[in-house]
Amino acid sequence: LKGQEFAPSHQQVYAPLRADGDKPRAHLTVVRQTPTQHFKNQFPALHWEHELGLAFTKNRMNYTNKFLLIPESGDYFIYSQVTFRGMTSECSEIRQAGRPNKPDSITVVITKVTDSYPEPTQLLMGTKSVCEVGSNWFQPIYLGAMFSLQEGDKLMVNVSDISLVDYTKEDKTFFGAFLL
Amino acid sequence: LKGQEFAPSHQQVYAPLRADGDKPRAHLTVVRQTPTQHFKNQFPALHWEHELGLAFTKNRMNYTNKFLLIPESGDYFIYSQVTFRGMTSECSEIRQAGRPNKPDSITVVITKVTDSYPEPTQLLMGTKSVCEVGSNWFQPIYLGAMFSLQEGDKLMVNVSDISLVDYTKEDKTFFGAFLL
Amino acid sequence: LKGQEFAPSHQQVYAPLRADGDKPRAHLTVVRQTPTQHFKNQFPALHWEHELGLAFTKNRMNYTNKFLLIPESGDYFIYSQVTFRGMTSECSEIRQAGRPNKPDSITVVITKVTDSYPEPTQLLMGTKSVCEVGSNWFQPIYLGAMFSLQEGDKLMVNVSDISLVDYTKEDKTFFGAFLL
């Protein structure tokens, strides 16, 4: 009977118990982007550092070719921050001349790709107009939320303009996910 | 045999099971900073409320002298928001006179200190140029991500200008961490 | 003895073990808001999609009438992003005429309502001055943190101006919570 004493109650064990330390997890950090061919009508995807410095993947969560590969179905918390930097946006210069115009903008999208589904799914989007008055500018966009993912799903981070991404420090631009 | 029925499967028990409710967790909230001596060449660290209102520390996660002390090795989700407020940035005044200049900025860094390691490690940084056109301005910087921490590590939040932090409400400026 | 081998150690079982997959969780997404009566001196609450597209509620976490209902006491991670969009703020026009003035602003508040307590509690606030120089503008405010909640607590998201919320895409404006 002693063995039963510490077993989880009958009510709780329909879903299997599992140790937290063996759950799929990843934190990826920015690397300098090399010019690549982008898909037409789709924001370019960032590629990432997955093992040096603060970056890691563990427990079957793998990174390959700009994608985080989901090894197990479940609810995941997914997050990313992208820090952008640029020179004066043309938007403000044009506006100063008295002509209204569409503002410049910066956008981050966390996208899910499911092989059995033809179109990628946009999970999270952060988008911001940038109409700075002169000088250099820099700012982060942060995103994070929980999603139900299936084994084999792939996650990537797309940005509106890859050349504006601040790739200088691993703490400024990053991407991660963990099974809850 | 009955005792074995609900025991986790052999595959799952190499890492010990543990109840979620006993994991180290903390949510700290802003208090007014009093002028102090800052370390040279390092952004000043904020100090925090750890037990009143919405703030708490639990399960051996302790707060002391501006630091959250990590009581157990593992993967932690760490987050902070700092709301800044200020008057017109000098930057915009200079720019209006037609001279380009380096913008004012606001920065938040979540830093890890490991006693056995000489240099602090910057885990997360949010940095934003502030070139407001006149009037008062206010805005938050939010950060959050997962990191592998070791027992004894210490976490702090550093800011570029402590006097611009909005200390008025516990929901505007905060810092937290929890073991996954 | 075999049954005991994989049972959690004595130290770990005072808090009941439970499967992660059966914890209360929700991710709600934006829907177009219909004009409603707002409480005086309180920002209006958003209502949400809870089952279509990326939205879901599970394990007794229910959504009803703008509220997420907490079904079980514990520590929850709560998050929201609201994307705002608008035309040129009056603030900048007045300022250009040389008169200083109070800036326009956008604010998101995640609020907890406890039936036994007369006043709602503001858990999280993101507030930002908006003084754009001409043109349209758009930008997100993101919030997320951990709180100790009680069974029966209700969560809502309030915004300073419901008419500025971008309701066009489920990835731009969302609200979620999950038991840790």
Epitope: - | R32, Q33, T34, P35, T36, Q37, H38, P44, G86, M87, E90, N136, D161, I162, S163, L164, V165, D166, Y167, T168, K169 | K102
Partner: antibody, heavy 118, light 107 residues
């Protein structure tokens, strides 16, 4: 400990200028705004302006614009307030004050009495 | 400029009394309201910041409330050292402005 020490009392003639110094110690001088507040005899408190010791940027109350100049010397952690074209109603105790945020005042100097009299 | 008004301008009370002082701003100042105590011949001392938050080291008998335009300072049980002048100050926008003060003296 954290303190602000001001220069001594001054007696000035109308039309003259006065310069009051404020030496900070026990904290990082460049990390916190320094303000000047005055109090006429038997009257309330009146904010004059601030300096950001880090950047040197200033902000003055309109009432004193053109007459007041606040400066600092970071090498000796000292702020200065100069008020020109003195009038008899400038007779007051002048305080330097700083705080953990730019909009409130935790630490105060002991005050400097400036008397303007012909 | 934001104009701050206080009432009453003076009050007489006894040790142990509960005292309340009100402060009103001419326009909304959110929670950017601070309270100071000044004893004769001394520099002011901050008591309450952010309208309702007690400055470290200040006795808990002092409390503040309010937001927007209307604010209150309360002293739950007056002590001999509390007889002084109390000022409110707005930190919402420059020029920062103080109320005219409320003098609390012994009845």
């Amino acid at each position: 400990q954290v303190q602000l020490v001001q220069s001594g009392a001054e007696v000035k003639k109308p039309g003259a200028s006065v310069r009051v110094s404020c030496k900070a110690s026990g904290y990082t001088f460049t990390g916190y705004y320094m303000h000047w507040v005055r109090q006429a005899p038997g009257q309330g408190l009146e904010w004059m302006g601030w300096i950001n010791p880090n950047s040197g940027g200033t902000n003055y109350a309109q009432k004193f614009q053109g007459r007041v100049t606040v400066t600092r010397d970071t090498s000796i952690s000292t702020a200065y307030m100069e008020l020109s074209r003195l009038r008899s109603d400038d007779t007051a105790v002048y305080y330097c004050t700083s705080g953990g945020s730019f909009d409130a005042f935790d630490i105060w100097g002991q005050g400097t009495m400036v008397t303007v009299s012909s | 400029d934001i104009v701050m008004t206080q009432s009453p301008s003076s009050l007489s009370a006894s040790v142990g009394d509960r005292v309340t002082i009100t402060c009103r701003a001419s326009q909304s100042i959110s929670s950017f309201l601070n309270w100071y105590q000044q004893s004769p011949g001394k520099a002011p001392k901050i008591l309450i910041y952010g309208a309702s938050r007690l400055q470290s080291g200040v006795p808990s008998r002092f409390s503040g409330s309010g937001s927007g335009t209307d604010f209150t300072l309360a002293i739950s049980s007056l002590q001999p050292e509390d007889f002084a002048t109390y000022y409110c100050q707005q930190g919402d926008s420059t020029p920062f402005t103080f109320g005219p003060g409320t003098k609390v003296d012994i009845k």
